[in-house]
């Protein structure tokens, strides 16, 4: 067990052009506070995924009012450290998210308003018990300077807080086979309870005689580094020398999650999804309160009035869940009618309508021909939800308002020439062809494949297509 400590040194405009406007003004005085979220390992995780190592919220900083015309200075900060207690071994590698929040103190209806000013994230290696590590992170035009460290809570010591120390029983020396506890020379290492030979750096135990490995290590004594390259089976070949995970019980076998938590395997370990009221790597920590910073994504924590809800998270727009851990999909409101497809664009909901329906929610059934006039003698044809006009000869377009070029489709066959005519088109056929569209060949003996031509028309004369 131990505590991760975060000290914010400054939050203000970063170097370079484009200094941000002060977040506070004379009309809207405000104060800052910070939230830190820790996750084990170096995985790239979404900001809203659970803070499995823990989270903490700072106190509110002093009230700040911008001086008119002055650039945004470093803003006044809350006092004290942000402390995230961890109950299990310190994982050595971790991801962090640090959020800077602004609390507006103007005449807000319903109390103060919160808004996220900046969010920085990173992945680091850190040994417990080491010195403060300094860091600078930039988010847009803002710059955050901070230090952090992990320290073990007595009696735990070591880089992972897995070795135990006890006060010396004798003033001069430790008991047989027990070393002094550096750096606490006046204390002695507690009697070993882990399996003999269990790596003090990479292994730990919670029960006498066991040896459990920190992330990245494997083998019965946690002395073999995990390699992801040469593993053949889902959990790797059985040779301990290859550095692959040994096949056998999966990480979720026997369900390591306490208090009704459900276990799911991750590439290197397992993850517990805890029921309400429990948290920690194995859902072993109960009695969550607002002091534990249980609300994600800027949710405001309010102490619950009864044991059923030790706290309640008031979520900012766009987030939901008992810990504001889930993004609201407003399409869950089922807003689109008539089989429309819903799209949540963040700033708005959109419905993509099926053919034959329209309106922001696809609520309008395009009652095909109702109230639709087809011009120039066209007739409306219903079908498929989209009205269509069947246009009279010489007209086209959606409503038959456009004059059609009857020759555009090259209607005259066999090289016949097309002429537009007030009542349609006329084909002048090439020698040897006849018919309204020059579609019929004239027989070599002069007889046509057609019945005798109408009076006054010889084969080869232009035929008017009526």
């Amino acid at each position: 067990a131990g505590v991760f400590e975060l000290q914010i040194h400054s939050f203000g405009p970063g170097p370079g052009p484009g200094a941000p406007r002060s977040p506070c003004s004379a009309r809207l005085p405000c104060r800052l506070f910070f939230r830190v979220c820790l996750k084990p390992g170096l995985s790239e995780e979404a900001a809203e995924s659970p803070c499995a190592l823990g989270a903490a919220l700072s106190a509110r900083g002093p009230v700040y009012t911008e001086q008119p015309g002055a650039p945004a200075p470093d803003l006044p900060l809350p006092d004290g450290l942000l402390q995230v207690p961890f109950r299990d071994a310190w994982p050595g590698t971790f991801s962090f998210i640090i959020e800077t929040w602004r609390e507006e103190l103007g005449d807000q209806i319903g109390g103060p308003a919160w808004s996220l000013l900046a969010r920085v994230a990173g992945r680091r290696r850190l040994a417990a018990g080491g010195p403060w590590a300094r860091d600078i992170q930039r988010a847009g035009a803002w710059e955050l300077r901070f230090s952090y460290r992990a320290r073990c809570e007595p009696p735990a010591v070591g880089t992972a807080c897995t070795r135990l120390c006890r006060p010396r029983s004798a003033p001069s020396r430790c008991g047989p086979g027990l070393r002094p506890c550096a750096p606490l020379e006046d204390e002695c290492e507690a009697p070993l309870v882990c399996r003999a030979g269990c790596s003090p750096e990479h292994g730990f135990c919670e029960q006498p005689g066991e040896c459990r490995c920190l992330e990245g290590w494997t083998g019965p004594l946690c002395t073999v580094p995990v390699s992801t390259s040469s593993c053949l089976s889902p959990r790797g070949p059985s040779s301990a020398t290859t550095g692959c995970l040994v096949p056998g019980p999966g990480p979720c076998d026997g369900n390591p999650c306490a208090n009704g938590g459900s276990c799911s395997e991750t590439p290197r370990s397992f993850e517990c999804t805890c029921p309400r009221g429990f948290y920690g790597l194995r859902c072993e920590v109960s009695g969550v309160t607002c002091a534990d910073g249980p609300c994600f994504n800027g949710g405001l924590c309010v102490g619950g009035a009864d044991p059923d809800s030790a706290y309640i998270c008031h979520c900012p727009p766009g987030f939901q869940g008992s810990n504001c851990e889930k993004r609201v999909d407003r399409c869950s409101l089922q807003p689109c009618r008539n089989g429309g497809l819903c799209l949540d664009l963040g700033h708005a909901l959109r419905c993509r309508c099926r053919a034959g329906f329209a309106g922001p929610r696809c609520e309008h059934d395009l009652d095909d021909c109702a109230g639709r006039a087809c011009a120039n003698g066209g007739t409306c044809v219903e079908g498929g939800g989209a009205h269509r006009c069947s246009c009279a000869l010489g007209f086209g377009g959606r409503d038959c308002r456009e004059r059609a070029d009857p020759c555009a489709a090259r209607p005259c066959a066999h090289g016949g020439r097309c002429y537009a005519h007030f009542s349609g088109l006329v084909c002048a056929c090439a020698p040897g062809y006849m018919g309204a569209r020059c579609e019929f060949p004239v027989h070599p003996d002069g007889a046509s494949a057609l019945p005798a031509a109408p009076p006054g028309l010889r084969p080869g004369d232009p035929q008017r297509y009526l």
Epitope: V328, S332, L333, Q334, R337, R361
Partner: antibody, heavy 117, light 107 residues
């Protein structure tokens, strides 16, 4: 015609549990989300949240997280509101209402819940 | 959360009057404003949705208007059956919120 018919009035003691039903008819139940609204005696309307009738996923307004649970029996076109560990301040009329994409277009007649020791 | 304010909590009018009930949102709600009628027996009905669209079966004497943050419901020719409490509700941003209601009585 479209109807939402709710179960009858309930008289409960503090700490008990109540489950209210809302039976829908006249439309395809799973096409529309179902919402719940609370009205305390002499007060206005307060939106409690909704349940997606296609997936069964509930969504709660902040003041109704914890002791409140929305559920469905799709085969019976029925939505339910359950309130656990009842308190005096839960005394109210609870309405179910269908959402059509713009508004809650059809409402149940309301179910009165009285919590008294 | 968006606050909805109905400044008039009760209103007296005579039969045949033109009555207007107003509602103000604490921020722009992009016309996603609905009006509901609650009769003395407790039943609730939708009257107007999306600021000005009349719900099916609602008499044409009811109309709605507005934009941005200010909206109103008008009853052009008050009838006895219109005696009720009227609530506005914004559907633009979760959580949805209602106005406090305006109780309409006959003089």
């Amino acid at each position: 015609q479209i109807q939402l018919v709710q179960s009858g009035p309930e008289l409960k003691k503090p700490g008990e549990t109540v489950k209210i039903s809302c039976k829908a008819s006249g439309y395809t139940f799973t096409d529309y989300s179902m919402h719940w609204v609370k009205q305390a005696p002499g007060k206005g309307l307060k939106w409690m949240g909704w349940i997606n009738t296609e997936t069964g996923e509930p969504h709660y307004a902040d003041d109704f997280k914890g002791r409140f649970a929305f559920s469905l029996e799709t085969s019976a076109s029925t939505a339910y509101l359950q309130i656990n560990n009842l308190k005096n301040e839960d005394t109210a009329t609870y309405f179910c209402a269908r959402y059509d994409g713009y508004a809650m277009d059809y409402w149940g007649q309301g179910t009165s819940v009285t919590v008294s020791s | 959360d968006i606050q909805m304010t109905q400044t008039t909590s009760s209103l007296s009018a005579s039969l045949g009057d033109r009555v207007t009930i107003s509602c103000r949102a604490s921020q722009d709600i992009s016309n996603y404003l609905n009006w509901y009628q609650q009769k003395p027996d407790g039943t609730v009905k939708l009257l107007i949705y999306y600021t000005s669209r009349l719900h099916s079966g609602v008499p044409s004497r009811f109309s709605g208007s507005g934009s941005g943050t200010d909206y109103s419901l008008t009853i052009s020719n008050l009838e006895l059956e219109d005696i009720a409490t009227y609530f506005c509700q914004q559907g633009d941003m979760l959580p949805w919120t209602f106005g406090g209601g305006t109780k309409l009585e006959i003089k």
